[in-house]
């Protein structure tokens, strides 16, 4: 049935981009719970994939960040790029691979007392991320910003979260991106467990709200680690520092 293909209580998935940008391997993803492969979704063709476009880091996988692919490139074109490894140059935390953060322009290993061991699960999902682009370009304005005299409400089409009213983020829904509510404590959230997996989503959830991060629900015991339920949970006291 359709519900077994697109379960509304989890991110609904599409095949990954073929031959896309860094972080998006051209081959089909290997079998994993909740992920469909080329030919696995009857509502989409797979003959015209492109590098995954983005407006902010939350739209990219845990191993990626959002930026213009070329330093002198078109400011209006941003895609998800592979994260930067330890000792590589950076401008913000999201550019660094999980387990690292940006310090003095260099990706360095996260100190366990500074960031929790679960940083790889939360680095792109804390509220208040720095959404600046790699080179500080201003983003292209289109009809969406011209048409809005006020910030977008729930269900409004958006290009980025700044188009949306407070408490909302810009996330994919079907073939558009719309303003959806930022997640509250206890609500189910989505983990990007596999590189590039964000590109599979056609029904994105927002990130967790301020002071919350997306973690495995403590009392949710299942046989498979990858199918554990994640919910928005309060940070512990030593986890108040925002990563971005």
């Amino acid at each position: 049935t359709l519900n077994s293909v697109l379960n509304s209580n989890a991110i609904k998935n599409l095949p990954p981009p073929l031959g896309g940008a860094a972080g998006h391997p051209g081959s089909a993803v290997s079998a994993a719970p909740g992920i469909l492969y080329p030919g696995g979704n009857k509502y989409q063709t797979i003959d015209n994939y492109q590098p995954y476009p983005c407006a902010e880091d939350e739209e990219c996988g845990t191993d990626e960040y959002c930026a213009s692919p070329t330093r002198g490139g078109d400011a209006g074109v941003q895609i998800c790029l592979a994260c930067r490894k330890r000792r590589k140059r950076c401008m913000r935390h999201a550019m660094c691979c999980p387990g690292n953060y940006c310090k003095n322009g260099i990706c360095v290993s996260s100190d366990q007392n500074h960031f929790r061991g679960e940083i790889e699960e939360t680095i792109t999902e804390s509220f208040g991320n720095d959404h600046s682009t790699l080179d500080g370009y201003s983003r292209r304005t289109t009809l969406s910003s011209k048409m809005y005299h006020t910030k977008g409400q729930e269900g409004s089409v958006c290009l980025r979260s700044s188009d949306c009213a407070s408490g909302l983020c810009c996330a994919r829904h079907f073939w558009s991106k719309i303003c959806k509510p930022v997640l509250k404590e206890g609500q189910v959230c989505t983990k990007h467990r596999r590189k590039g997996s964000h590109g599979l989503e056609i029904f994105q959830r927002c990130y967790c709200g301020e002071g919350l991060s997306c973690r495995i629900q403590k009392d949710h015991h299942q046989a498979s680690n990858s199918s554990r339920l994640h919910t928005c949970q309060r940070h512990h006291h030593h986890h108040h520092h925002h990563h971005h």
Epitope: S8, E154, V157, K180
Partner: antibody, heavy 117, light 111 residues
Amino acid sequence: EVQLVESGGGLVQPGGSLRLSCAASGFTFSSYAISWVRQAPGKGLEWVASVSGWGDTYYPDSVKGRFTISRDNAKNSLYLQMNSLRAEDTAVYYCATSLKNYAFDYWGQGTTVTVSS
Amino acid sequence: EIVLTQSPATLSLSPGERATLSCRASESVDDFGISFMNWYQQKPGQAPRLLIYAASKQGSGIPARFSGSGSGTDFTLTISSLEPEDFAVYYCQQSKEVPPTFGGGTKVEIK
């Protein structure tokens, strides 16, 4: 002013092909999703195909493999290539877009496709 | 796919009267804190026009006499006081899941 103008409809025999066009104006075409929705005579509405602003395409089972949606952002145009047409494809075909919200908030006036021998 | 059932099929009313149209979904169309239910009006020979989206939000330029309510599986479109131009067919449509589906329509005719 947002405008969507369909063309290309007509009479075609079963098994034949037809290409519909939708000319868009009044908005930044390349940034937005756009779809085809059809309505058989005296019947309700049925979603036919959609293409996102980033170029992915989507179809229901009823047309998958027979219809192809495409867009030419340079020409602000949307297309629907219809092959292996059947009598049940007879309908008014509308292009519709989602500019302000996720629903189909702007529609063209429609173009009529008749599949008959 | 989600099936939408509209009732009644035909509603015979006079100008000035209140119209209440119903749409029932085969499963909940709520997700992400939003009810993904929309309502359209269609007059003979014309394209549909969006009236309501997200169950209760008005489309652009829609008169205040049109309002939507409901959540989950049961939704209502209300026209507080029918104007002559309101006699038309009304469709509900869900955007929670692919494929997006439409109800069979309710025809509001002059009594």
